[in-house]
Amino acid sequence: SQPQAVPPYASENQTCRDQEKEYYEPQHRICCSRCPPGTYVSAKCSRIRDTVCATCAENSYNEHWNYLTICQLCRPCDPVMGLEEIAPCTSKRKTQCRCQPGMFCAAWALECTHCELLSDCPPGTEAELKDEVGKGNNHCVPCKAGHFQNTSSPSARCQPHTRCENQGLVEAAPGTAQSDTTCKNPLEPLPPEMSGTMLM
């Protein structure tokens, strides 16, 4: 097999063999190498010399193959916008941010730019579990049968009703979606409001 051309090489149709790693330089009508992530163009290519790439200086980065003559400035995660850092900026990657706990992304422009507090889920409901934390606001769903949740909270989970018999007790009042089962000692008398039903 014939060896492929290595940049710089002439291109009459203004396209390059590897669009990701090469670019067309119209002045010389040649294809030149782009610079790899973490670097920038320190010397442009010519007909006899390929692009020279230098490493981005501290606190700057380039994430992709590029023919930029500068690196992008690293930006911190803005706590005022509800963001926190999960991975620092490097020469090859911008600072990785996410919404702070209890918040969701309210404004998205290629990445999250603004987070807001998650809505509370009322008693008897819980927030539907999402694939990615912080991606959207809470969608509250009712507790499934045999479970309860008794607060207004963005994060509280429905808990299973207590089983009185597991504790050697008997049920005094059944659990609901908003309250746990009430248990009592089997020897205790019924509360006054229930004594009528016992007489029956």
């Epitope: 230098a54 606190n59 490097t90 090859k92």
Partner: antibody
């Protein structure tokens, strides 16, 4: 602790291909670029290229373009380096190396595999 | 591509002596993006220094690095028996990264 464990020694005939594996553990595999460096017997170190395990993006040294392919399998935290159309001067120890994790640009190598000897002879 | 030339090729010294290893670049290495490695026979290289003068984790303070631009130096203040090995410099300031040819530090 960080470990890079490479596949065993290989003996190949000229014109054949070899595929060396490098299993990573002790860190997030997709978080750092993986590099391949080779060393011919009694010679110095030679950079071959890198792979971004997160995206699968690669960068090969010009000398190896068209002959080397770097891939990864994130499900088993393993990087691979395949070199084709082997010649006798490809006889070398092949190392995988993880880029550094401190300092700004991290294209120096803090952790290395134990090396895989590839011998090419007819 | 930046070519790194290491000198001397071999350095014969006794334990306790000071070792000075040189690494010269064919062009300026931006931001002192230079690393040093130690390699013993049959082993993988071990990172000693990065950023020209920053010691890697677990490296004893008898190892120090200096220099900028095109001239860099690795100094071992007092050679210990375990320091006899081959030392390589590597630049990562310009793509592609490159290694020097190595300096062997042997027992006199």
């Amino acid at each position: 602790q960080v470990q890079l464990v490479q596949s065993g020694a290989e003996v190949k005939k000229p014109g054949a291909s070899v595929k060396v594996s490098c299993k990573a553990s002790g860190y997030t595999f997709t978080g750092d670029y993986m590099y391949w460096v080779r060393q011919a017997p009694g010679q110095g170190l030679e950079w071959m290229g890198w792979i971004n395990p997160n995206s699968g993006g690669t960068n090969y040294a010009k000398k190896f373009q068209g002959r080397v392919t770097m891939t990864r399998d994130t499900s088993i935290s393993t990087a691979y380096m395949e070199l084709s159309r082997l010649r006798s001067d490809d006889t070398a120890v092949y190392y995988c190396a993880r880029e550094g994790s401190s300092g700004w640009s991290a294209e120096y190598f803090q952790h290395w595999g134990q090396g895989t000897l590839v011998t090419v002879f007819s | 591509e930046i070519v790194l030339t290491q000198s001397p090729g071999t350095l014969s010294l006794s334990p306790g002596e000071r070792a000075t290893l040189s690494c010269r670049a064919s062009q300026s290495v931006s931001s002192s993006f230079l690393a040093w490695y130690q390699q013993k026979l049959g082993q993988a290289p071990r990172l000693l220094m990065y950023g020209a003068s920053r010691r890697a984790t677990g490296i004893p303070d008898r190892f120090s690095g200096s220099g900028s631009g095109t001239d860099f130096t690795l100094t071992i203040s007092r050679l210990e028996p375990e320091d006899f090995a081959v030392y390589y410099c590597q630049q990562y300031g310009t793509s592609p990264l490159s290694f020097g040819g190595g300096t062997k530090v042997e027992i006199k």
